[in-house]
């Protein structure tokens, strides 16, 4: 009966050699795709000269296969019932699922020019950098291929800087041949209700990016949750992409290939201002751009990106305050297309389908010492791209799952 099923589930979701969970955990059986839409700027000169609204047109999808590599350095610690690992990063372009090639060109914000005065707020340094920006013929916007923009290019301005700095720039640089982690997660052997919950990340229990409890590493990595998930439960998970822990709440029941799953969605209040959601006060780390912490829907992750002015939001500034999207024309936020969800099978806690959507933005501010930016009359949080990372359990796996899990319960 139920006790037997519960016992089987408890045994099979433990993260140790020989279990169903472990096999899928080491190397996901799901094909995961990451689709990119690039925001192509239509009026670069007008913006740089007159501080006009930025007109963007999204181009995509450009699709890559990701998360196809198995976890590495897997080490069980029987003492504290944890397993540690690193997740290698890799991306393979999928031409058949893309609107063009990796050589397609886009007009985007010049990442180095925008970041330089933000990182170096000292006038003297800015004057020095300005001479190098001019010498390299760099400006506020640049034309780059998809491949360059995502994975890195040698920046002509940074190449002239006379002290040792990284001269390669890219939204996801470095990515291929890098790893995420070390993650140390509970294997559930002693307590199944802790299975897959992250004990530490990069050797620490906190991130050192945020003040107070915002800095905590909560929950799992969202690939699975402790079993016997109830609709009333808030699913907490950590996402290294956005440098924070976040949560999802029950949205609806879905039938996924004959498997009943719970769709958990990221609620709007996860992106709210401290005014709307006081719990978010520690995610507001600066007062100027955030209009004294009243703006919402964007997250300043600069501390996690070596001080670069990187802001994360939902695509097309979904759930963001009007002041954020006002300087940008051509955005059309849409709940269905742009929200993030996790379809979790409630008995096992396995995420059988997901869509992770996020947008990468760069802050650019007027800088009186940088000629390329001195005509700006206001700061802009400039959308660079948005991504949709999706995975769905395969038909074969779904059948197997039905036979082994849901079928037995019915």
């Amino acid at each position: 009966g139920d006790m037997l099923i519960e016992k089987t589930i408890k045994r099979e979701v433990v993260l140790e050699e020989g279990t169903t969970a472990f096999k899928n955990w080491v190397k996901t059986g799901t094909t995961v795709y990451r689709q990119f839409w690039i925001f192509d700027v239509q009026n670069p000169d007008d913006v740089a000269k007159n501080s006009s609204k930025i007109k963007v047109k999204q181009r995509g999808p450009y699709t890559y296969r990701v998360r196809y590599l198995a976890k590495e350095n897997i080490t069980q610690d029987p003492e504290d019932h944890t397993v540690s690992f690193v997740q290698p990063n890799g991306a393979i372009f999928e031409p058949s699922l893309s609107v063009g090639t990796e050589d397609d060109n886009f007009t985007v914000l010049n990442l180095a020019v925008a970041a330089a005065p933000h990182i170096y707020q000292n006038s003297f340094v800015q004057v020095v950098l300005n001479s190098l920006i001019k010498k390299s013929k760099s400006s506020m916007f640049q034309t780059r291929s998809l491949k360059e923009l995502l994975w890195g290019y040698k920046d002509p301005f940074l190449s002239l800087v006379p002290y040792p700095i990284s001269t390669t720039v890219g939204v996801f640089y470095p990515y291929n041949d890098t790893v995420d982690g070390v993650y140390k997660v509970f294997n559930g052997k002693d307590n199944i209700s802790k299975v897959a919950i992250i004990e530490s990340y990069k050797g620490k229990r906190n991130l050192s990016y945020w003040p107070s409890y915002c800095d905590m590493i909560n929950g799992t990595d969202a690939a699975s949750f402790p079993p016997f998930v109830e609709k009333s439960r808030t699913l907490r998970f950590f996402s290294s992409d956005i440098c924070r822990s976040i949560y999802a709440v029950f949205g609806s029941e879905i039938d996924l290939k004959g498997i009943p799953v719970y769709r958990f969605v990221l609620p709007a209040n996860a992106f709210a201002s401290p005014l709307q959601n006081p719990d978010n006060h520690c995610f507001c780390t600066e007062k100027v751009i955030s209009n004294n912490c009243t703006s919402y829907g964007v997250l300043d992750i600069g501390k996690c990106k070596e001080g670069k002015p990187v802001y994360i939001s939902l695509p097309h500034f979904l759930h963001a305050s009007p002041d954020v999207s006002e300087p940008i024309e051509g955005l059309h936020p849409n709940e269905d297309e742009h929200r993030t969800y996790l379809d979790v099978e409630p008995i096992t806690g396995f995420t059988l389908q997901f869509a992770k959507r996020l947008q990468v933005n760069i802050l650019v501010k007027p800088a009186r010492k940088i000629e390329a930016l001195k005509n700006l009359k206001r700061p802009y949080i400039v959308p660079i791209l948005w991504l949709n990372e999706t995975g769905t359990i395969g038909d074969e796996k779904a059948e197997m799952f039905k036979t082994q899990v849901t079928g037995k319960i019915k």
Partner: antibody
């Protein structure tokens, strides 16, 4: 409060070198540029160069390249300027001056008189 | 290099009178001009920074204006304590360059 204290007066022979120090307190040393300024007797001010202690980046006035070398010791929050191959033309008061982000030469040392004489 | 031409070289003014010092630059520097006061035996003191910004604690009788290549520094009511040398500094580009200075004396 912010203070810049320079080393005492120097009397040096032509052809020799001299190293002037500027010890700072009351601020985060690495975050602000330290400049050096020359003032010959009864004359105007000349910018020699600046150093950003955070990464050691220096920029010199072309006129003083080869004459002045700027360095910092972050552990003691001290900036140094070495002047070499001294001639009577180098006799002057030398000031260190510190920026405040977007404000140039917001704070000054008291000056160091260098006299080059045989 | 941007050269800065300051005039007059010296100025003798009675107490309560208005003082005007001018600096002209060889290149357009927007409003990146600064003004310093130096009293005998002392280092210079910043009075007005870029953008014609009066520094905190500096009396409001001091002001400046100008944009591009032509800049003016004004003392509204001359006081005896204002006797000093005054220098302008362009901070738009490197090398930073000072004007030759104006010696302000009391009549």
């Amino acid at each position: 409060q912010i203070q810049l204290v320079q080393s005492g007066p120097e009397l040096v022979k032509p052809g020799a070198s001299v190293k002037i120090s500027c010890e700072t307190s009351g601020h985060t040393f690495t975050e602000y540029t330290m400049h050096w300024v020359k003032q010959s007797h009864g004359k105007s001010l000349e910018w020699i160069g600046g150093i950003y202690p955070n990464n050691g980046a220096t920029k010199y006035n072309q006129k003083f390249k080869g004459k002045a070398t700027l360095t910092v010791d972050k552990s003691s929050s001290t900036a140094y300027m070495e002047l070499r191959s001294l001639t009577s033309e180098d006799s002057a008061v030398y000031y260190c001056a510190r920026d405040r982000y977007d404000v140039w030469f917001a704070y000054w040392g008291q000056g160091t008189l260098v006299t080059v004489s045989a | 290099e941007t050269t800065v031409t300051q005039s007059p070289a010296s100025l003798s003014v009675a107490t309560g009178e208005k003082v005007t010092i001018r600096c002209i630059t060889s290149t357009d520097i927007d409003d990146d001009m600064n003004w310093y006061q130096q009293k005998p035996g002392e280092p210079p003191k910043l009075l007005i920074s870029e953008g014609n910004t009066l520094r905190p604690g500096v009396p409001s009788r001091f002001s400046s204006g100008g944009y591009g290549t032509d800049f003016v520094f004004t003392v509204e009511n001359m006081l005896s304590e204002d006797v000093a040398d005054y220098y302008c500094l362009q901070s738009d580009n490197l090398p930073l360059t000072f004007g030759a200075g104006t010696k302000l004396e009391l009549k």
